[in-house]
């Protein structure tokens, strides 16, 4: 376990032309606050959920009012560090998002208004216990300067906060085979000789040979998740519960929700439903009310102003989550037809249609034939965003300008011979067959299989196909 710490040094206009306008004015004083979101791993796919390592909100900065005519200076910042506690090992590689939020303090109907000024993101390698790392990130015309570090909470030490340290038993040196705990030279690395088979993920030991379980796990080797299902049974006067075997680890096994929050599995992660007065991915932030602005991305906060009062975030379209922190890409399933470009405007989806198409989803095919001509008596057929010609017999090609060979497809059946003709083609049928394409056998007695041959046409005569 440990804490990620973020120190904001400055937030103000970046170098170069196009300095941003001050976010505050005499008419509309405001103050800043920051939000940090941490995810494990260096790639987007490594993040199991939004802010899977944790998130934190800063305090509000001092109220700032722009001096008329003055350029936007570095804006006054909140005091103190942003601290994101982590319960498990520090992953070493992480992604961060730091958001700068503006709280407007003018006469707002329904309380203060929040808006996102800037968002910076990055991916970094960082060993726990190391020195402060300095960073500069730019978002548009704004520049954010900050430092960060990860430190272990005693008794954990090491670059991942997975080693345990204990005070020295003797003043001069550590026990046999044990190293001093740098930088805590007066402490020694604890021997991690737990009971054989003790779960390395869910168990730990403070004395050799023991196996103590992390919250949510039970059993002699801490391999059994404590279930919240009906199989719990009381044990002794304290009504403590025995574990239930639930196959396969799930994100709610070992309940990651703090402060009495209840855990629900989501399609890829988990979600904590927090009791009144708590919020955060794991209900780890306490005493939050609407005055703290817990709703992101323009979410509307509804709830009382006293610390014990719950709040609810009503999210705008395109966002969800208990704090409106999850963005939904509604264009992902390509709702625009016929190659239209999808635009998620937040309040609505819009499709920008290719030429020849229209409609909310580009589903309507416009008249492609306007101003188009098909040669040699062809007729224009619209469709697919481009005009097509249905050509008269004997012609082909895109505009019916090419002469077609009607016999190319061998249309005469049963060995009939094909002759090109000004009005199409003529089939000279082999003996025993008749019809426009020689498709009908002539009965042995000379009667046709057809009801009657057209006047002036005898079986065996060449048939002209019109």
């Amino acid at each position: 376990a440990g804490v990620f710490e973020l120190q904001i040094h400055s937030f103000g206009p970046g170098p170069g032309p196009g300095a941003p306008r001050s976010p505050c004015s005499a008419r509309l004083p405001c103050r800043l606050f920051f939000r940090v979101c941490l995810k494990p791993g260096l790639s987007e796919e490594a993040a199991e959920s939004p802010c899977a390592l944790g998130a934190a909100l800063s305090a509000r900065g001092p109220v700032y009012t722009e001096q008329p005519g003055a350029p936007a200076p570095d804006l006054p910042l909140p005091d103190g560090l942003l601290q994101v506690p982590f319960r498990d090992a520090w992953p070493g590689t992480f992604s961060f998002i730091i958001e700068t939020w503006r709280e407007e303090l003018g006469d707002q109907i329904g309380g203060p208004a929040w808006s996102l000024l800037a968002r910076v993101a990055g991916r970094r390698r960082l060993a726990a216990g190391g020195p402060w790392a300095r960073d500069i990130q730019r978002a548009g015309a704004w520049e954010l300067r900050f430092s960060y570090r990860a430190r272990c909470e005693p008794p954990a030490v090491g670059t991942a906060c997975t080693r345990l340290c204990r005070p020295r038993s003797a003043p001069s040196r550590c026990g046999p085979g044990l190293r001093p705990c740098a930088p805590l030279e007066d402490e020694c690395e604890a021997p991690l000789v737990c009971r054989a088979g003790c779960s390395p993920e869910h168990g730990f030991c403070e004395q050799p040979g023991e196996c103590r379980c992390l919250e949510g796990w039970t059993g002699p080797l801490c391999t059994v998740p404590v279930s919240t299902s009906s199989c719990l049974s009381p044990r002794g006067p304290s009504s403590a519960t025995t574990g239930c075997l639930v196959p396969g680890p799930g994100p709610c096994d070992g309940n990651p929700c703090a402060n009495g929050g209840s855990c629900s599995e989501t399609p890829r992660s988990f979600e904590c439903t927090c009791p009144r007065g708590f919020y955060g991915l794991r209900c780890e932030v306490s005493g939050v009310t609407c005055a703290d602005g817990p709703c992101f991305n323009g979410g509307l906060c509804v709830g009382g102003a006293d610390p014990d009062s719950a709040y609810i975030c009503h999210c705008p379209p395109g966002f969800q989550g208990s704090n409106c922190e999850k963005r939904v890409d509604r264009c992902s399933l390509q709702p625009c037809r016929n190659g239209g470009l999808c635009l998620d405007l937040g309040h609505a989806l819009r499709c920008r249609c290719r030429a020849g198409f229209a409609g909310p989803r580009c589903e309507h095919d416009l008249d492609d034939c306007a101003g188009r001509a098909c040669a040699n008596g062809g007729t224009c057929v619209e469709g697919g965003g481009a005009h097509r010609c249905s050509c008269a017999l004997g012609f082909g090609g895109r505009d019916c300008r090419e002469r077609a060979d009607p016999c190319a497809a061998r249309p005469c059946a049963h060995g009939g011979r094909c002759y090109a003709h000004f009005s199409g083609l003529v089939c000279a049928c082999a003996p025993g067959y008749m019809g426009a394409r020689c498709e009908f056998p002539v009965h042995p007695d000379g009667a046709s299989a057809l009801p009657a041959a057209p006047p002036g046409l005898r079986p065996g005569d060449p048939q002209r196909y019109l």
């Epitope: 993040a47 959920s49 399609p267 890829r268 939904v328 890409d329 992902s332 399933l333």
Partner: antibody
Framework: QITLKESGPTLVKPTQTLTLTCTFS??????????VGWIRQPPGKALEWLAH???????RYSPSLKSRLTITKDTSKNQVVLTMTNMDPVDTATYYC????????????????WGQGTLVTVSS | DIQMTQSPSSLSASVGDRVTITCSAS?????MYWYQQKPGKAPKLLIY???NLASGVPSRFSGSGSGTDFTLTISSLQPEDFATYYC?????????FGQGTKLEIK
């Protein structure tokens, strides 16, 4: 063109284990955002979600059936396998597999393509 | 578990009618998904993320709602629309479906 097809036994005896395979084409479970789920429908009844698996091997099971279900994927074969132990006549149903898409980390975009389904009867 | 309750359970209507099916969730679900199923066939996705039309679905279908109450509307019923319709939530496990609404020809 995206297609999914379920295969497996049509008749199983009570207490036996059912193994169903979903073979799909037109997308890959090595692509970020892709998943495959299993849904069943007893004759004349409503749909019931059973389990799903994502490209990065994140799995979810219906809590009421979790102890009996196992879902696995073979990315190279474009297959997802569901096993269900200790079958009972009440498990008689048409079993469907379907593609699930999630482009937003934890928000499902849609379960947009379904297999034709395979009817599994549990009877001695 | 989040319970999904559809109403009505069955509905008789005529070609050209405007039809509305509602789905009520026992707790907030953020988004709703709607499927159409015809006898002997697999379900087909109609609406995703509450109001977005799936590919190839006619524009007479529309979805709306938020929180716990959602609606599927067919603006002018066509012969091919007579089927059973299901809603589904993807918020919390188990990812439950409604009991279905059977739309029959009057």
């Amino acid at each position: 063109q995206i297609t999914l097809k379920e295969s497996g036994p049509t008749l199983v005896k009570p207490t036996q284990t059912l193994t169903l395979t979903c073979t799909f084409s037109g997308f890959s479970l090595s692509t970020s955002g892709m998943g495959v789920g299993w849904i069943r429908q007893p004759p004349g009844k409503a749909l019931e979600w059973l389990a799903h698996i994502w490209w990065d091997d994140v799995k979810r099971y219906s809590p009421s059936l979790k102890s009996r279900l196992t879902i696995t994927k073979d990315t190279s074969k474009n297959q997802v396998v569901l096993t269900m132990t200790n079958m009972d006549p009440v498990d008689t149903a048409t079993y469907y597999c379907a593609r699930i898409v999630s482009f937003d980390n934890d928000v499902v975009s849609a379960m947009d393509y379904w297999g034709q389904g395979t009817l599994v009867t549990v009877s001695s | 578990d989040i319970q999904m309750t559809q109403s009505p359970s069955s509905l008789s209507a005529s070609v050209g009618d405007r039809v509305t099916i509602t789905c009520s969730a026992s707790s907030s679900v953020s988004y709703m998904y709607w499927y159409q199923q015809k006898p002997g066939k697999a379900p087909k996705l109609l609406i995703y993320l509450t109001s977005n039309l799936a590919s190839g679905v006619p524009s007479r279908f529309s979805g709306s709602g938020s929180g716990t109450d959602f609606t599927l509307t067919i603006s002018s019923l066509q012969p091919e629309d007579f089927a059973t319709y299901y809603c589904q939530q993807w918020r919390h496990n188990p990812f439950t479906f409604g009991q279905g609404t059977k739309l029959e020809i009057k």
